[in-house]
């Protein structure tokens, strides 16, 4: 009876996500067979989040809308470890929008999910950000510094990275 109700709950939860994500990849969390964490297929997972590299080129606003439709946001990077994981899936000759912007042009950077912007946990390339007109952040590769952030014009199409919380069933 317990197993039956748990299965029913799982199925109803899966149905919620089905319109955006027809296929989920789930792994057992810990030793308890009852706890599964899932990411949409073919998203990648790291800690408690799922990540999707969008290779379509869009402006920052359209990229964020695109992530939103999938139940996600443009990526918010909270730690060096998280960035190190993300860059494993990026191409060196491409740039990718982050969920970081300065819409007022006053150097008040803000994350899309309202995570406080912490100057101590940022990975700007040296000399960046450097232009008040460039109000959106990308992550890209520079041979001298490897991967880091740069400010660019928001309307210039780039690839992007979406991030969502893992789905627990």
């Amino acid at each position: 009876n317990f197993m039956y109700s748990k299965t029913v709950k799982r199925l109803s939860k899966l149905r919620e996500y089905q319109q955006y994500h027809p296929s989920l990849t789930c792994v057992m969390e810990g030793k308890d067979i009852e706890d599964w964490s899932c990411c949409p297929t073919p998203w990648t997972s790291f800690q408690s989040s799922c990540y999707f590299i969008s290779t379509g080129m869009q402006s920052w606003t359209k990229s964020q809308k695109n992530c939103s439709v999938m139940g996600a946001d443009l990526v918010v990077i909270n730690t060096r470890e998280e960035q190190d994981f993300i860059i494993q899936n990026l191409k060196r000759n491409s740039s990718y929008f982050l969920g970081l912007s300065d819409p007022g042009g006053r150097r008040h950077w803000q994350w899309v999910d309202q995570t406080p912007y912490n100057e101590n946990v940022t990975f700007w390339h040296s000399g960046e950000p450097n232009n008040l007109d460039e109000r959106c952040a990308i992550i890209n590769f520079r041979s001298s510094e490897e991967w880091g952030w740069n400010d660019i014009h928001c309307h210039v199409p780039q690839k992007s990275i979406c991030k969502m919380k893992k789905i627990y069933i």
């Epitope: 869009q58 402006s59 920052w60 606003t61 359209k62 964020q64 809308k65 912007s101 819409p103 007022g104 042009g105 450097n130 232009n131 008040l132 007109d133 460039e134 109000r135 959106c136 660019i152 014009h153 928001c154 309307h155 210039v156 199409p157």
Partner: antibody, heavy 121, light 111 residues
Framework: EVQLLESGGGLVQPGGSLRLSCAAS????????MSWVRQAPGKGLEWVAT????????YYPDSVKGRFTISRDNSKNTLYLQMNSLRAEDTAVYYC??????????????WGQGTTVTVSS | DIVMTQSPDSLAVSLGERATINCKAS??????????VNWYQQKPGQPPKLLIY???NLESGVPDRFSGSGSGTDFTLTISSLQAEDVAVYYC?????????FGGGTKVEIK
């Protein structure tokens, strides 16, 4: 008062090259993103190129990518547009304009009087 | 690319009467409560002049008989009381995503 003065237009044969200049005054040129916009005879407006204040980021539509190069010399307060492999359809009045950001978008708020480029054999 | 379609192509209005120009974007140009559409006026032999930005914000120095409205994909420029000096071609433009694109223009004349 903001002033933008384009020069360098003229008659050129198909396949030829031309360099347009835009002399800026009345504002701090080195802090402004700048753009070129063109208008074919009797037609509408078409964005051609944009360059950020430092000159390290440039953007073009597909119609001119690989043929046109936007650049700037902040010490001379001058914007340039190098146009190569010119075609008949590049015939237009070319305007330089200042770019002003508006949240995630932008406006082109000051425009020069334009310089005419004619591509014909 | 985002296509901006203006209507009508031309418009003849009596002095003092209202002129309305429409602009339709092929996809939404909104984000977070702002619309990334601008309107320009171009008089014969002159460069374009910015009138309205962000769909509804009047540029400094522009007479308040000009107004803009709309959101999403549908935008309107209104001249509440047409003056002789308003004879011009009017263009909408989106700045949400490169390439920036302009409408084909609407020619406003006096009837």
């Amino acid at each position: 008062e903001v002033q933008l003065l384009e020069s360098g237009g003229g008659l050129v044969q198909p396949g030829g090259s031309l360099r347009l200049s835009c002399a800026a005054s009345g504002f701090t040129f080195s802090t402004y993103t700048m753009s070129w916009v063109r208008q074919a005879p009797g037609k509408g407006l078409e964005w051609v190129a944009t360059i950020n204040s430092g000159g390290d980021n440039t953007y073009y539509p597909d119609s001119v990518k690989g043929r046109f190069t936007i650049s700037r010399d902040n010490s001379k307060n001058t914007l340039y547009l190098q146009m190569n492999s010119l075609r008949a359809e590049d015939t237009a009045v070319y305007y330089c304009a200042t770019y002003r950001p508006y949240y995630y978008g932008s406006v082109l708020d000051y425009w020069g009087q334009g310089t005419t480029v004619t591509v014909s054999s | 690319d985002i296509v901006m379609t203006q209507s009508p192509d031309s418009l003849a209005v009596s002095l003092g009467e209202r002129a309305t120009i429409n602009c339709k974007a092929s996809q939404s140009v909104d984000y977070d409560g702002n619309s990334y559409v601008n309107w320009y006026q171009q008089k014969p032999g002159q460069p374009p002049k910015l009138l309205i930005y962000g769909a509804s914000n009047l540029e400094s120095g522009v007479p308040d008989r000009f107004s803009g409205s709309g959101s999403g994909t549908d935008f309107t420029l209104t001249i509440s009381s047409l003056q002789a000096e308003d004879v011009a071609v009017y263009y909408c433009q989106q700045s949400d995503e490169d390439p920036w694109t302009f409408g084909g223009g609407t020619k406003v004349e006096i009837k």
